[in-house]
């Protein structure tokens, strides 16, 4: 039989300080013993155990060091065969920094956004981008990228975009939020800080919040990574509710929860084509949605909502290759 | 199939404007990076600008920045590079290219024909 | 800026004959480098991406390897369509740069 790799993709991207296991299989025709091995290219190969059909490399605690080409190389009897899977370590930790912190509505006009210790910093794989309401603002005045001051052996950077902002004095100013967003194979992940815009420099919070302080929301598609929790202390912050996705008959399952104790609900407040496209169930801290592969799937934001609290968890799909529909 | 096509090269003088499109089919545009890459006359490629998927983030090689913007039409799945305050070292073929929606860094897997552009007086 | 510089800058040989191409980053670039080849008039077409991943539709005749600032393109038995210009490219960090190409010549 072929040589098979889990996953199968060429490129397999793991998160700087995050786990990834690479495993090899291999099966013999008559019966023969296959030897099936892990070799490292150019790289630190992390831990190996073979036995006589396959191979598992483990990543552990990924630092940029592991990036590199792996190759499984597998043999029955006279006959070898190769595959070579290329693994890429990223770090894009839930760090956002926003200049200023809030907003004065007729009086700032400026505002910056900084991802912090992320790499790579390529403008296909990191894109910056500030929202008022739901509507991209349009290109940045300015956008720099300069090395964090390095810690060990790992170089990480920070990127940051300057915008000019429209006029803001309304009597309700749109919400005003920094994204930032990794895109690499196989993943997609984005954290989002709100910037409070204030009516005047006396009214200290900004109508329909309780804080200024800007608050992180988190969203990650096709992606088998789980994101690095937000730094500093994750137990003061408000509970948030998570977007989970499964393969389902037909389609793919969304779950949204939110594991907060007694006294909460989340529900679904969008979908790509609007809601009722979608089959929908909700149970208190638990809210399922099915969305259908058929043809292109469905592609764009889906976001569920905590209640009491607020909180939101987007998650962008993107469509799949497109499946002819099926003949009627 | 992906085809990129691009337009609005010719003659311009020193000092003068003109804007290249480009056209999409057969990709995923508004998921799509996309990019600006020219080539002078006989020699190597250079990047020039490059969009996001949404086109919130832009960025620019320094030679052109302040003069080049690059911007899309998601609707027209159609790519811009207006060029102004153009130089004679300006004069290349410009290429288009994209890349496929799911990679994040893969390179520009898609390119177009290219068309010139020659600034002169 | 990361430069990028190609060696050699042009090269003769035969068919069947096994090339390699290096490409060295002034600064680690991890697995950021792509291959492309571009003949007279032509686009540029993707060879290899992320180091040593082929791109579909290309001939496992092309291989790349390296990490960090040293990369290599390996054409193992050259034919006749290969010979064209050969460029790397990081795109690890902004501004993306390509190195000045190779230019590989029938002999």
């Known amino acids: 039989g072929p040589l098979e790799v889990e996953p199968p993709d060429s490129v397999v991207a793991v998160s700087m300080g995050g786990s990834r296991q690479l495993t090899c299989r291999l099966s013999c025709a008559d019966h023969r013993a296959p030897s099936v091995q892990w070799r490292g290219l150019d790289t630190s190969l992390g831990a190996v155990r073979s036995d006589a059909g396959s191979s598992v490399l483990s990543v552990h605690n990924a630092s940029l060091s592991a990036a590199g080409t792996h190759v499984c190389v597998g043999s029955c009897g006279n006959l070898t065969l190769q595959r070579t899977v290329q693994l890429l370590v990223f770090a894009f930790p839930d760090q956002l920094t926003v200049s200023p912190v809030a907003l004065v509505a007729k009086q700032d006009r400026e505002v910056a956004c900084t991802a912090h210790n992320v790499t790579p910093a390529s403008p296909e794989a990191l894109s910056l981008s500030l929202l008022l309401g739901d509507r991209e603002l349009g290109e940045a005045l300015s956008r720099e990228v300069e090395e964090e001051p390095q810690q060990g052996e790992d170089l990480l950077f920070q990127v940051t975009g300057r915008w000019l902002l429209p006029s803001l004095d309304t009597p309700t100013p749109p919400a005003l939020h920094c994204r930032a967003t990794m895109t690499l194979p196989g993943v997609q992940l984005s954290h989002q800080r709100a910037i409070p815009v204030l009516r005047s420099l006396t009214s200290r919070e900004p109508p329909g919040t309780t804080s200024p302080e800007a608050t992180p929301e988190l969203s990650s598609t096709r992606s088998s990574e789980s994101p690095a929790p937000p730094a500093g202390n994750s137990s003061a912050r408000p509970c948030r509710p998570k977007i989970h996705q499964s393969p389902a008959a037909g389609g793919l399952e969304l779950l949204c929860e939110a594991a907060c104790g007694p006294g909460v609900a989340v529900g679904w407040t969008q979908a790509p084509g609007g809601l009722e496209a979608y089959q929908r169930r909700e149970a208190g801290a638990q809210a399922w949605l099915s969305v259908p592969r058929a043809g292109c799937g469905p592609e764009g934001w889906f976001q569920c909502r905590l209640d009491p609290g607020g909180q939101m968890a987007s998650l962008y799909l993107v469509a799949e290759v497109c499946s002819p529909p099926a003949p009627p | 199939e992906v085809q990129l096509l691009e337009s609005g090269g010719g003659l311009v003088q020193p000092g003068g404007s003109l804007r290249l499109s480009c056209a999409a089919s057969g990709l995923t545009f508004n998921n799509s990076a996309m990019t600006w890459v020219r080539q002078a006359p006989g020699k190597g490629l250079e990047w020039v600008s490059t969009t996001s998927g949404s086109g919130g983030t832009t960025y620019y090689a320094d030679s052109v920045k302040g003069r080049f913007t690059i911007s899309r039409d998601s609707p027209k799945n159609t790519l811009y590079l207006q060029m102004n305050s153009l130089r004679a070292e300006d004069t290349a073929v410009y290429y288009c290219?994209?890349?496929?929606?799911?990679?994040?860094?893969?390179?520009?897997?898609?390119w177009g024909q290219g068309t010139l552009v020659t600034v002169s007086s | 800026d990361i430069q990028m510089t190609q060696s050699p800058s042009s090269l003769s040989a035969s068919v069947g004959d096994r090339v390699t191409i290096t490409c060295r980053a002034s600064r680690s670039i991890s697995s950021y480098l792509n291959w492309y080849q571009q003949k007279p008039g032509k686009a540029p077409k993707v060879l290899i991406f992320f180091v040593s991943s082929l791109q579909s539709g290309v001939p496992s005749r092309f291989s790349g390897s390296g990490s960090g600032t040293d990369f290599t393109l390996t054409i193992s038995s050259l034919q006749p369509e290969d010979f064209a210009t050969y460029y790397c490219q990081q795109n690890y960090i902004p501004p993306i740069t390509f190195g000045q190409g190779t230019r590989l010549e029938i002999r």
């Open positions: 290219a994209a890349r496929g929606y799911s990679y994040g860094t893969t390179p520009y897997e898609y």
